[in-house]
Interface confidence: low
């Protein structure tokens, strides 16, 4: 028998500093977890405990901190490779600042294979991306070889932007050919690492033959056995078996994700590449483990560009932006009205000639606006203006509802109005109109959306049986603020990009900007 | 090794603008700050800004944010710094250098440039 | 921004003896451990070379009579048993915040 150690991450997101226990910003460093440099401390830990070692990454390191927004993915190359991983797969996010933010910062600077057998390039962009990432790697480890196949979301054109020259195809498909070239290889040990979340991770157990292990991304999935040892609750044991349409015990695995956790795995294989066993459990990184004094001394340097990016001027507002709760808890705001304007704006994407947009709406919980920004500061913006505003470190994602869903959240949204609670709703593509009057739960009297499939876009009545697409904040996709309808109901989460950054893309985009109050949301007494 | 090669001297009138090239080699460009610093004769050293040129980030200092412009080439490793409205003040030795890396100098400048003898004069 | 001071401006000194250069921040430049001042050594018409990083850390290639001590606002430059191609000028260099920014020089003469 032959044992492999896997260790694993993804969805770190641009955690490169240690985090608080909920993944946002560090504030008592004796409580803080998660960071390269105690991961460094672990896997160096591991690396000279055991003999077969891989650190693998199953994606989306990019996206999600001030870090990201400032090195575009440098960072990410610069801390992998002092990391010395071994292998990554391609998740959606890497896409996001188009395909040559990802050649130039990460795939020309990686010193581990990215992999992705389900991207395929075509046109002008085949030669220059050609073997800047591969569909498989065969990786020598001790004595034996191990091929890493590698898959991404196949949502990708509709999470992120890479652009009209990347196919991407039905994993299943493109990953079964590779796994056979594998095989006739005589590579008999072969792990699928990806991105495209726990269901086709459990997919590719279940239908791709050959492979032995799955390492997984993009669901943030939590896995364990016993007790778990911080908040996040177990989907189901660690690791957890599917058993493939060909009699094999198949273990799939993922690591939740912003770095908190590394996945550590244990696989026995026979001398004809079978998994004999698998056992192991998620590190949780806290400060028990301590940080690596070198990386922590890299770090600290690359942050000092930070604090002096925060306080750039990024544009310019000619009105005041109004984000008190005493405006955004009770009425239509136009800070609230800029941010989800800003969340459609970074979900553009062409893909259909029938559609002028996959998704056109937005909601946005009041109580998450936390701070106005006054224009009578030569109107400047800077980062740290809207990390007033946006202090929370969330993400605004995109998920799929029925019309009765969204009807069920608006009436949550006004149900105990007048209370200066956070739950009232800021929107974009949406006019609602609310009658007061009427008891709580009935108070919705007008819901129009805009079109998305349509070449002039205009606002139709909400139809309570069709699936509609919306961008919010990961907060409300997990039902905060009360809003439990939506995690009950969603019918589709995919996580999107930091908050900050969204509409500091958007401010920067326009340079002057000067949101108005234009009748989105409206309340009418008696009949409509 | 690692070198930092820099272009020659300069002679500006008042008003004009200078650009300073700096081509580095001996090791990766774009995992590295490149910095510029000036030297006014008997005056101490002067930090202007730096650029990162991985990411084209860049950094200036107030006291020249208005005039000057860094930028970098990846394909040929070189970084620029561009002062314009150049006046008698200006008149220095400009250097680049590169900063520290891994686990070493946290943003000391290890290695430097011959540096370039910048003259605004009518 | 923070302004580093040197002194003494100048000094004299024969081969052999033992040098002391001080250099004051208006701030404190160190945390998690870590000092983020640096020396460095320049001779007429060159470019400046690095000596000490982080306060206390020998540059390699650097011989080892250089040292440095500190932390917070207060740093030394030492240099034991001095030797006639020492005679330069030496400076330090925070890298704290942005700006970074340099002490204004001590010329040391053998």
């Known amino acids: 028998a032959w044992e492999l150690t896997i260790l694993h991450t993804n969805d770190v997101h641009s955690r490169l500093e240690q985090t608080s226990e909920d993944s946002s910003k560090c504030v008592n460093a004796s409580r803080c977890m998660g960071g390269v440099a105690r991961l460094f401390t672990k896997v160096q830990q591991i690396r000279r405990a055991e003999p077969n070692v891989l650190l693998l990454d199953a994606g989306d390191q990019y996206q999600g901190t001030i870090w990201f927004t400032v090195y575009k993915g440098a960072e990410v190359a610069h801390f992998m490779n002092a990391l010395r991983y071994d292998a990554m797969a391609l998740g959606n996010h890497e896409f996001d600042n188009g395909v040559e933010g990802l050649i130039e910062p990460l795939l020309k600077e990686a010193k581990f294979p990215i992999l992705s057998a389900n991207i395929k390039a075509k046109g002008p962009l085949a030669s220059q991306i050609s073997g800047l990432y591969l569909p498989y790697k065969v990786l020598p480890v001790g004595d034996e070889v191990v091929g890493i196949v590698g898959y991404t979301s196949k949502e990708t054109p509709f999470l992120s932007n890479p652009g009209t020259n990347l196919v991407f195809e039905d994993e299943i498909t493109a990953l079964q050919p590779e796994v056979d070239k594998l095989k006739t290889l005589n590579v008999n040990k072969i792990i699928a690492l990806g991105h495209s979340g726990f269901e086709m991770d459990k997919l590719i157990a279940q239908k791709v033959r050959g492979v032995d292990v799955v390492v997984g991304g993009h669901s943030n999935t939590f896995l364990y056995t016993g007790n778990p040892p911080s908040k996040e609750v177990p989907a189901g044991k660690y690791p957890f078996i599917v058993t493939s349409d060909d009699g094999r015990k198949v273990p799939v695995v993922q690591a939740y994700a912003f770095g908190k956790y590394l996945g550590y795995l244990k696989i026995e294989f026979d001398e004809r590449g079978n998994v004999i066993s698998s056992h192991g459990n998620p590190i949780l990184l806290n400060s028990s483990i301590p940080e690596d004094p070198s990386i922590k001394a890299d770090i600290n340097k690359w942050r000092i560009k930070l604090d002096n990016y925060s306080t750039q001027e990024l544009g310019k507002t000619i009105v005041y932006l109004d984000g008190s709760s005493q405006s955004c808890r009770f009425r239509e705001c136009n800070m609230g009205n800029l941010i989800c304007d800003a969340m459609i704006n970074n979900n553009l994407r062409h893909t259909d000639e029938m559609f002028w947009n996959h998704v056109s709406m937005c909601i946005l919980n009041g109580g998450g606006i936390r701070s106005p920004i006054d224009e009578r500061n030569n109107g400047t913006i800077t980062w740290e203006n809207l990390a007033a505003v946006l202090p929370f470190g969330g993400t605004f994602d995109l998920v799929q509802l029925k019309g009765s869903t969204l009807k069920k959240a608006f009436e949550h949204s006004v149900h105990r109005y007048g209370q200066s609670t956070g739950e009232f709703l800021q929107v974009g593509g949406i006019h609602v109109v609310y009658d007061l009057s009427r008891k709580p739960g009935d108070r919705v009297v007008k819901l129009d959306v805009l079109c998305t499939k349509c070449r002039v876009p205009s606002y139709d009545p909400l139809k309570m049986d069709e699936v509609y697409k919306v961008i919010l904040p990961n907060f409300l996709a997990n039902g905060g603020d009360g809003f439990q309808m939506i995690k009950d109901e969603l019918l589709r989460h995919d996580s999107g990009d930091q908050d900050i950054n969204v509409v500091s893309t958007y401010i920067s985009k326009m340079k002057v900007i000067y949101p108005a109050v234009e009748g989105r949301i409206k309340f009418s007494t008696g009949s409509h | 090794q690692v070198q930092l090669v820099q272009s020659g001297a300069e002679v500006k009138k008042p008003g004009a603008s200078v650009k300073v090239s700096c081509k580095a080699s001996g090791y990766t460009f774009t995992s590295y700050w490149i910095t510029w610093v000036r030297q006014a004769r008997g005056q101490r050293l002067e930090w202007i800004g730096d650029i990162y040129p991985g990411s084209g980030n860049t950094n200036y200092n107030e006291k020249f944010k208005t005039r000057v412009t860094i930028t970098a080439d990846k394909s040929t490793s070189t970084a620029y710094m561009e002062l314009s409205s150049l006046r008698s003040e200006d008149t220095a030795v400009y250097y680049c250098?590169?900063?520290?890396?891994?686990?070493?100098?946290?943003?000391?400048?290890?290695?430097w440039g011959q540096g370039t003898l910048v003259t605004v004069s009518s | 921004e923070i302004v580093l001071t040197q002194s003494p401006d100048f000094q004299s000194v024969t081969p052999k003896e033992k040098v002391t250069i001080t250099c004051r921040a208006s701030k404190n430049v160190s945390t998690s451990g870590y000092s983020y001042m640096h020396w460095y050594q320049q001779k007429p018409g060159k470019a400046p070379k690095l000596l000490i990083y982080l306060a206390s850390n020998l540059e390699s290639g650097i011989p080892p009579r250089f040292s440095g001590s500190g932390y917070g606002t207060d740093f030394t430059l030492t240099i034991n048993n001095i030797e006639s191609e020492d005679a330069a000028y030496y400076f330090c260099q925070h890298s704290r915040e942005l700006p970074f920014t340099f002490g204004q020089g001590t010329k040391v003469e053998i």
């Open positions: 250098a590169k900063e520290g890396g891994l686990t070493t100098e946290d943003y000391a400048l290890d290695y």
